[in-house]
């Protein structure tokens, strides 16, 4: 659930979401619209269409929870719980790393930006 | 070859704890991905998952009976223990311990080996 | 949790006949497994992951479905067929079983 990423998202990238993420450009954060503002925003957008299809698939995506190690900068989901959970781990890692593959671009400016100036196509999963 | 039996009280009264052991071979519980449940039937019915553990005494549960439930191991003397506390006549049944397949993809969660089960009579 | 409905709860089939055992599920699932078991003794493995049948099992049988819609397929009924079958998922947690099915034979 949303406990397993904050706590994934600050170990690989070694920042506090709650003040660096959650809400960070159009797409981190709940919910999400328009085009992304850049790649870490492009990270969290994916991340949303990972959890949409696990919604799809009838996981209860915020209330799942998965256990997982963290050792020498690398996630290893385990692979004892649900077919839900595992898949879930998987996609919280995923954003996770690309977050931490673009802490050089990230924008200050980017952080708690007003969804209303989220404009264009959002895009497709 | 692997084997595993069940043992218990046979029968008990209501509000007394029912202490059940599955005594296994052919496999160790120290072996990476290996795990054991704890399985019930009462008569002529369906299977209910009770508990589960794992090599690593990782332990999962039933969430409708959680409260009551304990799953340990010993792993040098090859055996799972499910403790039920409070027991009412609802839980009568035939107990099952089950190993969980060794699995090559990581999402399969079935019981490749059961043993022979044993009944749990609950008296009011 | 995942709530599995099998149908039918009780059948009966002839040598020979095709039978088709079918579980359903209160949402999407991954994949299904099935346990046979016959009076008396603990059940067993018989299908894994939807459609793989498990060590022993006689070719005669076959598992299929996905999403909430899943069966178990016997393509000419044997006397040895004559058993309960569950399945099972884990999908989410909790694990849950199946209520059974009994086949029975004509």
């Known amino acids: 659930g949303i406990l397993n990423l904050n706590k994934m998202v600050k170990q690989v990238t070694g920042k506090m979401p709650i003040l660096s993420y959650w809400p960070y450009g159009c797409h981190c954060g709940l919910g999400g619209r328009g085009q992304p503002k850049d790649a870490t925003d492009w990270c969290c957008q994916t991340h949303d269409c990972c959890y949409d299809h696990l919604k799809t698939q009838g996981c209860s995506i915020y209330k799942d929870y998965y256990r997982y190690n963290f050792s020498q900068g690398n996630i290893h989901c385990s692979d004892k719980g649900s077919w839900c959970e595992q898949q879930l781990c998987a996609c919280d890692k995923e954003v996770a790393f690309c977050l931490k593959r673009n802490l050089d671009t990230y924008q200050k400016r980017l952080r708690f930006y007003w969804r209303p100036h989220c404009r264009g196509q959002t895009p497709g999963c | 070859q692997v084997t595993l039996k069940e043992s218990g009280p046979g029968i008990l009264q209501s509000s007394q704890t029912l202490s059940l052991t599955c005594s296994f071979s052919?496999?160790?519980?120290?072996?990476?991905?290996?795990?054991v449940s704890w399985i019930r039937q009462p008569s002529r019915k369906g299977l209910e998952w009770l508990a589960h553990?794992?090599?690593?005494?990782?332990?999962r549960y039933n969430p409708s009976l959680k409260s009551r439930l304990t799953i340990s191991k010993d792993t040098s003397r090859n055996q799972v223990f499910l403790r039920i506390n409070n027991v009412d006549t609802a839980d009568t049944a035939t107990y099952y311990c089950?190993?969980?397949?060794?699995?090559?993809?990581?999402?399969?969660?079935?019981?490749?080996?059961w043993g022979t089960g044993t009944t749990v009579t609950v008296s009011s | 949790q995942i709530v599995l409905t099998q149908s039918p709860a009780i059948m009966s089939a002839f040598p020979g006949e095709k039978v088709t055992i079918s579980c359903s599920a209160s949402?999407?699932?991954?994949?299904m497994y099935w346990y046979q078991q016959k009076p008396g003794s603990s059940p067993k493995p018989w299908i894994y992951?939807?459609?793989n049948l498990a060590s022993g099992v006689p070719a005669r049988f076959s598992g299929s479905g996905s999403g909430t819609s899943y069966s178990l397929t016997i393509s000419s009924m044997e006397a040895e067929d004559a058993a309960t079958y569950y399945c099972?998922?884990?999908?989410?947690?909790?694990?849950?079983f199946g209520a059974g099915t009994k086949l029975e034979l004509k």
């Open positions: 949402s999407s699932v991954s994949y």
């Open positions: 099972q998922q884990y999908h989410t947690y909790p694990l849950t």
């Open positions: 052919g496999f160790s519980l120290s072996t990476s991905r290996m795990g």
């Open positions: 089950a190993r969980r397949a060794l699995y090559d993809y990581g999402a399969d969660f079935y019981f490749d080996v």
């Open positions: 553990i794992y090599w690593d005494d990782d332990k």
């Open positions: 992951r939807t459609s």
